[in-house]
């Protein structure tokens, strides 16, 4: 008799793929544009990235550091009207893109939470949650919660409101903290909270340290659903050298949890390459005309247009990974097992029941080397085969689809491999 199939876990929409943050509408759209109507015109692009949710804003009225002139129920007219927002919601729904609204109150000011008037602000947030849930948003994000006194109890209350409306609604909290204990204390009191933090930004870009951070986090959080990013808002290029961007994309898309990206991460958008642009929100490079300030500063291969035409680009890799992440059971909700490998390497298996299994091998170092996969670290349920098919490499040159002998597997500097192999009874 065939073995019984393992029961599928309940999957919420945010379990099925990546979230895409657009914190600054104007920077995202560029050319002096930057409103909700313009964003609606970019939804096809988001669809092409196969992201499941758009984390938008903040877009509410906020006069810097003035609590009285901060209205979480009103859209700043610079971004458009409530009608524009409703229209965006409808269009997004048609494309199966969920909309999460950032309600961080004092986003233009010094302290995101008006630290002297916490109770006033908390009431405003409560009212806003109810208002925007009725308006049809799929969830909320609040950032900088390390600046919010009694954050855990407020988050629990806001979570109750959100989940009370529908189990299908999501609350995301963001913190600048990278301290695991602080992160765990925030998570402890909030069962379904998705938390973005700077935890992984301390990885020091080495395989051993990244492995240790990931496994510590997963062990500490147990069965709860995680999110993976390098910060609550900033671009990957703020933390990583260009040669590690592909590696991190592969890792974020294949770890168990929801990958969260900022606009531009998919093309390696880098504020440092655009003189005069703010580090936290540089202009999105749709094409070479997106940054006219310095002629010639932007080459085609830095842009969405240029990378869309190049199958070997970072954008093409992002799209492929996003697609795999959203359709393969082992990547959607599979078990995770990390195991030892050569120096500078981080390798792990994702597997679910009798479905196709995935092996990820990441070389964080700038030295090519034999993978040295230590299969003895793995439980019997996740053993390695002699060969696995190469689904993709983060670097050009390998023949995709070809079987690779795992015992003789060698990685290039900064190369990541995604390999697949069938379940074997």
């Amino acid at each position: 008799r065939a073995p019984r199939c393992r029961e599928l876990p309940a999957q919420k929409w945010w379990h099925t793929g990546a979230l895409y943050r657009i914190g600054d509408l104007q920077a995202f759209q560029g050319h002096g544009a930057g409103n909700l109507a313009g964003l609606k015109g970019r939804l096809d692009y988001l669809s092409s990235l196969k992201v499941k949710g758009l984390v938008l804003g903040p877009i509410h009225k906020n006069q810097k550091d003035d609590v009285a002139q901060t209205d979480l129920l009103q859209i700043d007219p610079n971004f458009g009207s409530k009608e524009d927002f409703d229209s965006l919601l409808q269009s997004a729904k048609k494309k199966s893109i969920r909309v999460i609204l950032d309600l961080t109150p004092n986003y233009r000011g010094e302290n995101s939470w008006f630290s002297t008037q916490v109770d006033t602000v908390a009431t405003k947030v409560k009212d806003a949650l109810e208002f925007w849930l009725q308006a049809g948003v799929d969830g909320f994000q609040v950032r900088d919660i390390e600046n919010l006194k009694d954050a855990s109890s407020f988050l629990a209350e806001w979570q109750n409101i959100t989940k009370g409306f529908s189990e299908d609604r999501l609350l995301i909290a963001g913190t600048n903290s990278s301290d695991l204990q602080q992160i765990l204390s925030l998570l402890e009191s909030n069962k379904d909270l998705l938390l973005t933090s700077s935890y992984l930004s301390d990885s020091g870009s080495t395989g051993e340290h990244t492995k240790s951070l990931v496994t510590q986090y997963l062990n500490a959080t147990g069965n709860r659903w995680c999110s993976w990013s390098l910060s609550q808002a900033r671009l990957l290029t703020s933390f990583l050298p260009a040669q590690l961007l592909r590696l991190y994309q592969l890792m974020l898309f294949t770890l168990p949890g929801t990958p969260v990206f900022s606009y531009g991460d998919e093309i390696g958008l880098d504020a440092a390459a655009l003189p005069g642009q703010p580090m936290e929100a540089p202009v999105m490079l749709w094409d070479e005309s997106s940054f006219p300030d310095i002629p010639g500063a932007v080459s085609a291969n830095m842009t969405v247009k240029g990378q869309s035409e190049d199958p070997g680009s970072l954008l093409s890799l992002f799209r492929r990974l996003s697609d795999q992440r959203s359709k393969e059971r082992s990547l959607l909700h599979g078990d995770f097992h990390a195991f030892s490998a050569g120096p500078g390497l981080f390798s792990y298996i994702r597997h679910w029941d009798q479905n196709e299994r995935f092996l990820v091998v990441l070389n964080f170092g700038d030295v090519g080397l034999s993978a040295g996969l230590q299969a003895s670290d793995l439980p019997a349920s996740a053993s390695l085969p002699a060969k696995a098919d190469l689904l993709l490499s983060t670097q050009p040159g390998r023949e995709e689809g070809s079987p690779l002998e795992l015992e003789r597997l060698k990685l290039e500097p900064h190369e990541g491999l995604l390999l697949r192999f069938p379940y074997a009874a």
């Epitope: 700038d366 030295v367 090519g368 080397l369 290039e412």
Partner: antibody
Amino acid sequence: EVQLVESGGGLVQPGGSLRLSCVASGFTFSSYWMHWVRQAPGKGLVWVSRINSDGSIIRYADSVKGRFTISRDNAKNTLYLQMNSLRAEDTAVYYCVREGRYTGSSLDYWGQGALVTVSS
Amino acid sequence: QSVLTQPPSVSGAPGQRVAISCTGNNSNIGAGYDVHWYQQLPGTAPQLLIYGNSDRPSGVPDRFSGSKSGTSASLAITGLQAEDEAAYYCQSYDSSLTGWVFGGGTKLTVL
């Protein structure tokens, strides 16, 4: 056929400068990391420097740090080694070397070498 | 003083087997970095002989083999021939020096 041809060697006084060039052919130069390795007369091989395929990652041996500069021009299929503040102990044959792909960073092709003599 | 230690010389008669050792430490061979071997015939540039501890590039006879264990590696040559007379170098990467390191070289004499 992979070929690496060094030039620019010669006799130079201590404290002087020299620039070595290496023209590559027979492979896609812009896809490979490259190295310089030297060998003093009658002695063993010593690694000098390494540069990645687009020139953004560079490493040097401690003995040449601050004095030697590796660079490349992918449009010209050429690797360079600018050597300043030369010392007698820099006297050696300098090899231009390609780093193999999928070989664990082995050095799979070597030029014939350029002799640099530092003497007064 | 080389980071990787090789015997200065070895010798053997034609047809015999010889082995050349290469000893490192926990920041190079012992750390898991690959060992490669090069042959340098008199008056010529070195040539890659073994890569990734035990793999042979095409064109290298199967008389040459490599192995690695712990902090050491070894090159074995069977069926020794006169044309094998050369200097042999092992090479690896060293994480504490953050650079490529070579053994001092071993001169093989075919008697």
